[in-house]
């Protein structure tokens, strides 16, 4: 039960995270005009990865796309790339994890396949989350650098007569959305990896041994022994009887060639 919960929760957390990464990537508020210690302007500027916008005091908003590829800063291109890679990996991870979910039955898919898929999706989510966090952090660093550069020469002009106030930009809402979303995707990925360990079918030592009792001949099925795999290991190799009901997350022993003597 715990494995299913961990896997399901990991999936949901990653799903929310990836939705957040997509939202952050599409948002226009990656950087917003710094209003602190600035003259009160009737115009508010904010910028995204794909376009820059201006909102006037009248409520009129005008956005202009960055229609050039070569003219854009390399850092912005890098951030775009990181976010897109994060989205693509996350989307593939979600697709893989849907089929890996224990609660979904697809034909006669074995637990080992589901475990592998869970691990794959988990790694994808981790990388996706890291891409988003890296992208947002690179952009934030770029903003901080530009902020202090523009603060250093806040006022430029001719002989001090005419002043030009440089627009300074600070962190926009998209950065926080991106950081949180990246973190959630990362956590979701870790949860999927943890769930994978519980899903992995344990290696069974298939050494069929016949024990001849004095009276009747009884063949013990090696499938009833819990092999030592490292997770919940049964080192004493005690016989585990299948008399009681089992939860879905307990390691199931599927029929093997040795089960039928």
């Amino acid at each position: 039960m715990a494995v299913t919960a961990c896997q399901g929760l990991g999936f949901v957390v990653s799903l929310i995270g990836i939705a957040g990464i997509i939202a952050a990537t599409c948002m226009d508020q990656w950087s917003t005009q710094d209003l602190y210690n600035n003259p009160v302007t009737a115009v508010f500027n904010y910028q995204g990865l794909w376009r820059s916008c201006v909102r006037e005091s009248s409520g009129f908003t005008e956005c202009r796309g960055y229609f050039t590829l070569l003219g854009l800063p390399a850092m912005l291109q890098a951030v775009r790339a990181l976010m897109i890679v994060g989205i693509v990996l996350g989307a593939i991870g979600l697709l893989v994890s849907i089929f890996a979910l224990k609660c979904i039955r697809i034909g006669s898919m074995e637990d080992s396949a589901k475990a592998n898929m869970t691990l794959t999706s988990g790694i994808m989510f981790i990388v996706s989350g890291l891409c988003a966090i890296a992208g947002v952090s690179v952009f934030a660093n770029m903003l901080v650098t530009n902020f202090w550069m523009s603060t250093a020469n806040m006022y430029t002009g001719m002989g001090g007569m005419v002043q030009t106030v440089q627009t300074r930009y600070t962190f926009g809402a998209a950065l926080f959305v991106g950081w949180v979303a990246g973190g959630l995707t990362l956590i979701g990925g870790v949860m999927m990896c943890i769930a994978c360990r519980g899903l992995a079918p344990e290696e069974t030592n298939y050494k069929a041994v016949s024990y001849h009792a004095s009276g009747h001949s009884v063949a013990y099925k090696p499938g009833g022994f819990k092999a030592s795999t490292g997770f919940g290991s049964n080192t004493k190799n005690k016989k585990i009887y299948d008399g009681g009901a089992r939860t879905e997350d307990e390691v199931q022993s599927y029929p093997s060639k040795h089960d039928y003597v």
């Epitope: 005009q33 003259p39 009160v40 302007t41 009737a42 115009v43 500027n45 904010y46 910028q47 820059s52 916008c53 201006v54 006037e56 005091s57 009248s58 409520g59 009129f60 005008e62 202009r64 005419v162 002043q163 030009t164 106030v165 440089q166 627009t167």
Partner: antibody, heavy 119, light 113 residues
Framework: DVQLVESGGGLVQPGGSRKLSCGAS????????MHWVRQAPEKGLEWVAY????????HYADIVKGRFTVSRDNPRNTLFLQMTSLGSEDTAIYYC????????????WGQGTSVTVSS | DIVMTQSPSFLTVTAGEKVTMSCRSS????????????LTWYQHKPGQSPKLLIY???TRESGVPDRFTGSGSGTTFTLTISSVQPEDLAVFYC?????????FGSGTKLEIR
């Protein structure tokens, strides 16, 4: 057709108060920011105050700050300018004007209402 | 506050003549975000309400004759009337629409000879 009609002007004693109104019609009043502009006799235009469409933002000229208050009643399509501690320098024709969507310009103006501060 | 300086204060011209008036601001009215200049020109005829002529420094308001042209960027702006008509007798004001307070220039009075 967009129409702005000011009212409430008249003769006021120095130190007195007055409340000007501006009735709007022909447009969705609640969607537009509004301004008050005045013109003293034989002088140029002087910007007085601004109020955003939802009343969340207000700005005033330094000369009227603390004495004048701009407000609006969107359901009644009316803009107000409450003036207190009036002095002779406040004698002017007061215009209300609508803020254009795009350009931050004042695209429609009322005919103005005259306020005279005198003893 | 932003100081708007208009020149000349008075202009006397004959009908059909080309006229140019200027407006200077103490700070740049150019917004880097959209590369627009937040400067507006108004025409105030005697006994009437002011009328919007040009916004964003060079965009003509609908219904305004094309003889009125706005130009300039940053801190220096110009209003040009290509062929003055008798009905153009008015005071022309420039206004800063970028910073609060929205200060006006002192105006340029146009008189027809």
């Amino acid at each position: 057709d967009v129409q702005l009609v000011e009212s409430g002007g008249g003769l006021v004693q120095p130190g007195g108060s007055r409340k000007l109104s501006c009735g709007a019609s022909g447009f969705t009043f609640s969607s537009f920011g509004m301004h008050w502009v005045r013109q003293a006799p034989e002088k140029g235009l002087e910007w007085v105050a601004y109020i955003s469409s939802d009343s969340s933002t207000k700005h005033y000229a330094d000369i009227v700050k603390g004495r004048f208050t701009v407000s609006r009643d969107n359901p009644r399509n009316t803009l107000f300018l409450q003036m207190t501690s009036l002095g002779s320098e406040d004698t002017a024709i007061y215009y209300c004007a609508r803020l254009r969507r795009g350009g931050n310009a004042l695209d429609y103006w009322g005919q103005g209402t005259s306020v005279t501060v005198s003893s | 506050d932003i100081v708007m300086t208009q020149s000349p204060s008075f202009l006397t011209v004959t009908a059909g003549e080309k006229v140019t008036m200027s407006c200077r601001s103490s700070q740049s009215l150019l917004n880097s975000g959209n590369q627009r200049n937040y400067l507006t020109w108004y025409q105030h005829k005697p006994g009437q309400s002011p009328k919007l002529l040009i916004y964003w420094a060079s965009t003509r308001e609908s219904g305004v004759p094309d003889r009125f042209t706005g130009s300039g960027s940053g801190t220096t702006f110009t209003l040009t009337i290509s062929s003055v008509q008798p009905e153009d007798l008015a005071v022309f004001y420039c206004q800063n629409n970028y910073y609060f307070p929205f200060t006006f220039g002192s105006g340029t009075k146009l008189e027809i000879r």
